[in-house]
């Protein structure tokens, strides 16, 4: 059976039941690769209270429709007089980014999730060439979600003192130049999430490969690398790379623009102070 949402397949995704202190790991096309959940678990529940793991969805027992994915298990659940099995159910809705699976509720037998994602859209209008997961949970299971920063067209201009070049970036996905045809970005190669513009030329200096990472409390890191082997002649033989560090501000303040903090041999380091780097509880307070 072919994978129903191939663009979601490359990653293991996370969702949280905050009420019960549970972290779910979800891999919709394969298994989550957590030993304690067994070799074929597609949905693995990590109970942080008891430090135990339980598989609540088996990759082998998958059934799919256009908007619903179900993973059964062979574990029976306690509903009296029935032979129900524990299962996970993921409802997919069209969204503007890859999005995040959200825990909805869990009964004795079924763990329910909802996922707003471009992967579920009938038309390709919001689909990216390349996009990576754009959220993380910290050790207290609080969500840090940069999805609202993702530009569906155009890009962010990085604050840089160099008058001869302009560095444009998008967050977690490539820059869509087709929907923004009148700008400098038109020359940016397809797939690039970090585009360096020099005069009338534009260069791919990084594409998203891995999802967002939490490196320290309230510091999130996104790394882009140039996939093509061909070196750029102004990089002194080095492969271009871009590291964007998103920082939660220490106090309430207006959002800033991304700033270039270091540049050497086509390695660009960017810092972006933004409240989106803060956990969701902070944003909602």
């Amino acid at each position: 059976q072919a994978a129903p949402f191939p663009e979601l397949c490359s990653y293991t995704w996370e969702a949280v039941d905050t009420k019960n202190n549970v972290l779910y790991k979800i891999n919709i096309c394969g298994s989550v690769d957590i030993v304690q959940c067994g070799p074929s678990s597609a949905v693995c529940m990590h109970d942080l209270k008891t430090r135990t793991y339980h598989s609540v969805g088996d990759s082998v027992l998958r059934s799919a429709t256009r908007s619903l994915l179900e993973f059964n298990t062979t574990v029976s659940c306690d509903q009296q007089g029935t032979n129900h099995r524990v299962q996970s159910s993921i409802a997919f809705l069209c969204g503007k980014t890859l999005g995040t699976p959200e825990f909805v509720t869990a009964t004795e037998c079924v763990h329910y999730f909802e996922w707003r994602t471009t992967a579920a859209c009938k038309k390709d209008i919001f689909k990216a060439n390349k996009e990576v997961p754009c959220y993380v949970f910290d050790e207290e299971l609080r969500k840090h979600d940069l999805n609202p920063l993702i530009k569906l067209s155009g890009a962010y201009l990085v604050d840089d003192s160099d008058p001869d070049t302009s560095l444009f970036i998008n967050v977690c996905r490539d820059i869509d130049t087709l929907r923004d045809p009148g700008s400098q970005l038109r020359a940016c190669p397809p797939g690039t999430a970090a585009c360096l513009v020099r005069g009338h030329q534009a260069f791919d200096v990084g594409q998203p490969r891995d999802g967002l990472k939490l490196v320290r409390k309230d510091r999130l890191v996104l790394s882009y690398v140039r996939e093509e082997a061909g070196k750029l002649d102004f990089c002194d033989g080095h492969s271009p790379a871009v590291t964007i560090t998103f920082v939660c501000p220490s106090e309430r303040r207006e959002g800033t623009i991304p700033k270039l903090t270091a540049k050497s041999n086509c390695r660009y380091e960017i810092e972006w102070i933004t409240e989106y780097a803060c956990h969701r509880d902070y944003l909602e307070s």
């Epitope: 039941d17 905050t18 009420k19 019960n20 202190n21 549970v22 209270k49 659940c77 306690d78 509720t105 869990a106 009964t107 004795e108 037998c109 763990h111």
Partner: nanobody, 116 residues
Framework: DVQLVESGGGLVQPGGSLRLSCAAS????????MDWYRQAPGKQREWVAT???????TYADSVKGRFTISRDNAKNTVYLQMNSLRPEDTAVYYC??????????WGQGTLVTVSS
């Protein structure tokens, strides 16, 4: 005052059954996740079963198929039905309530002895 009170422990023969109760007061019971733990003499406290606020249940491998956790929200009580008891089930059984807004609350424990 927030408290949990366990009851139902006692002496039972191997293969027998017991039902433990844990009555809660001072908390919105249905919002809380409830866990049973046990501590055998000279051993560390170990987790036995969980009943989440939404209703899902999980069990330690050692009790799976023999023990059942359930709750009665009207009575603010969680139960642990223990069947096919074995000598190695002998322990003090504790219940625990937890929610995102409260620190974990433990009961004082009830002793279960399985012996012939």
């Amino acid at each position: 005052d927030v408290q949990l009170v366990e009851s139902g422990g006692g002496l039972v023969q191997p293969g027998g059954s017991l039902r433990l109760s844990c009555a809660a007061s001072g908390i919105i019971f249905s919002d809380n996740r409830m866990d049973w733990y046990r501590q055998a003499p000279g051993k560390q406290r170990e987790w036995v079963a969980t009943l989440a606020s939404y209703g899902w249940k999980t069990y330690a491998d050692s009790v799976k198929g023999r023990f059942t956790i359930s709750r009665d929200n009207a009575k603010n009580t969680v139960y642990l039905q223990m069947n096919s008891l074995r000598p190695e089930d002998t322990a003090v059984y504790y219940c625990k309530a937890s929610s995102p807004v409260l620190n974990d609350i433990w009961g004082q424990g009830t002793l279960v002895t399985v012996s012939s």
